[in-house]
């Protein structure tokens, strides 16, 4: 559910949005770094009806769902999947 | 007090199509996802599609999607079902639900008294 | 998708019996797990959300514990009104009913 990416793109995210969307609702979350080409982090939102959103890194409520998939993700989910890209 | 009050149910041929309304009052209907549940007659409860606060993200389940969309309209606090190409396992008690919720914590906690839709020749 | 066993799926008890009705989740959902008691004709009325936590105005002897894969539904002592369907439901991925549990009277 939670991914952590490096890689050396460019920013992926045009515009982003700060609305709730359950987990319920979320299949998975891309979380890619600041730095290597893109001056923030982003974070990616996969949804179950296969759209893709770009959510403000900032919004208390994917801070909070991070927060709890984090926790989580030692018993309960996936390694977080981490990927460098060589320069 | 929270109310929802669904209509629009009826006898319909198969393949034929039928719009459910649910009409919402007692809460802000803006602030919250809402939802379809079906019950066939003698039956479990199963959800059918949800939608969010703008209506911009909706959500099927697989046996629906392509012929049923669901769709809300804030100024009127009003939710709808569009049911298309209907087939008899379609045949339900059609219930309007408020998914109460952040971080996913709290579901449907109320609900409207249905409205029967029969597919049938 | 994530499936949901109820069990029993029918249950005969007399008033005052200690029930419980189990849920068991195909795949680990935490506590993301409503229970639902409908009487015929009417809609479900919310009971117990996040496995545990008694919706305002439900009487305390519903009970609600498990995490996981594995929970239960726990009436301490059967009241008449209580004779009516149960349902789980999970909400951890899209949502799942169980098959409803149907509490008759012994």
């Known amino acids: 559910v939670l991914e952590v990416y490096y890689t050396s793109l460019r920013c992926r995210c045009v515009q982003e949005s700060s609305v709730f969307i359950p987990r319920r609702f979320i299949d998975r979350i891309q979380i890619l770094p600041r730095g290597n080409g893109c001056p923030r982090k982003e974070i990616i939102v996969w949804k179950k009806n296969k759209s893709i959103v770009c959510v403000d890194p900032q919004a208390e409520w994917i801070q909070r769902m991070m927060e709890v998939l984090r926790k989580r993700s030692s018993s309960t989910l996936p390694v977080p999947v981490f990927k460098r890209k060589i320069p | 007090e929270v109310q929802l009050v669904e209509s629009g149910g009826g006898l319909v041929q198969p393949g034929g199509s039928l719009r459910l309304s649910c009409a919402a009052s007692?809460?802000?209907?803006?602030?919250?996802?809402m939802a379809w549940v079906r019950q066939a007659p003698g039956k479990g409860l199963e959800w059918v599609a949800s939608?969010?606060?703008?209506?911009?993200?909706?959500y099927y389940r697989d046996s629906v999607k392509g012929r049923f969309t669901i769709s809300r309209d804030n100024a009127k606090n009003s939710l709808y079902l569009q049911m298309n190409s209907l087939r008899a396992e379609d045949t339900a008690v059609y219930y309007c639900?408020?998914?109460?919720?952040?971080?996913?914590?709290?579901?449907?906690?109320?609900w409207g008294q249905g409205t029967l839709v029969t597919v049938s020749s | 998708d994530i499936q949901m066993t109820q069990s029993p799926s029918s249950l005969s008890a007399s008033v005052g019996d200690r029930v419980t009705i189990t849920c068991k989740a195909s795949?680990?959902?935490?506590?993301?797990l409503t229970w639902y008691q409908q009487k015929p004709g009417k809609a479900p009325k919310r009971l117990i959300y996040n496995t545990n936590i008694l919706q305002t105005g439900v009487p305390s002897r519903f009970s609600g514990s498990g995490s996981g894969t594995e929970f239960t539904l726990t009436i301490s002592s059967l009241q008449p009104e209580d004779f009516a369907t149960y349902y789980c439901l999970q909400q951890s991925s899209l949502y799942t009913f169980g098959q409803g549990t149907k509490l008759e009277i012994k």
């Open positions: 795949q680990n959902i935490n506590k993301e």
């Open positions: 939608i969010n606060y703008d209506g911009g993200d909706t």
């Open positions: 639900a408020r998914e109460e919720d952040y971080d996913g914590s709290y579901v449907m906690d109320a």
């Open positions: 007692g809460f802000t209907f803006s602030d919250y996802y």
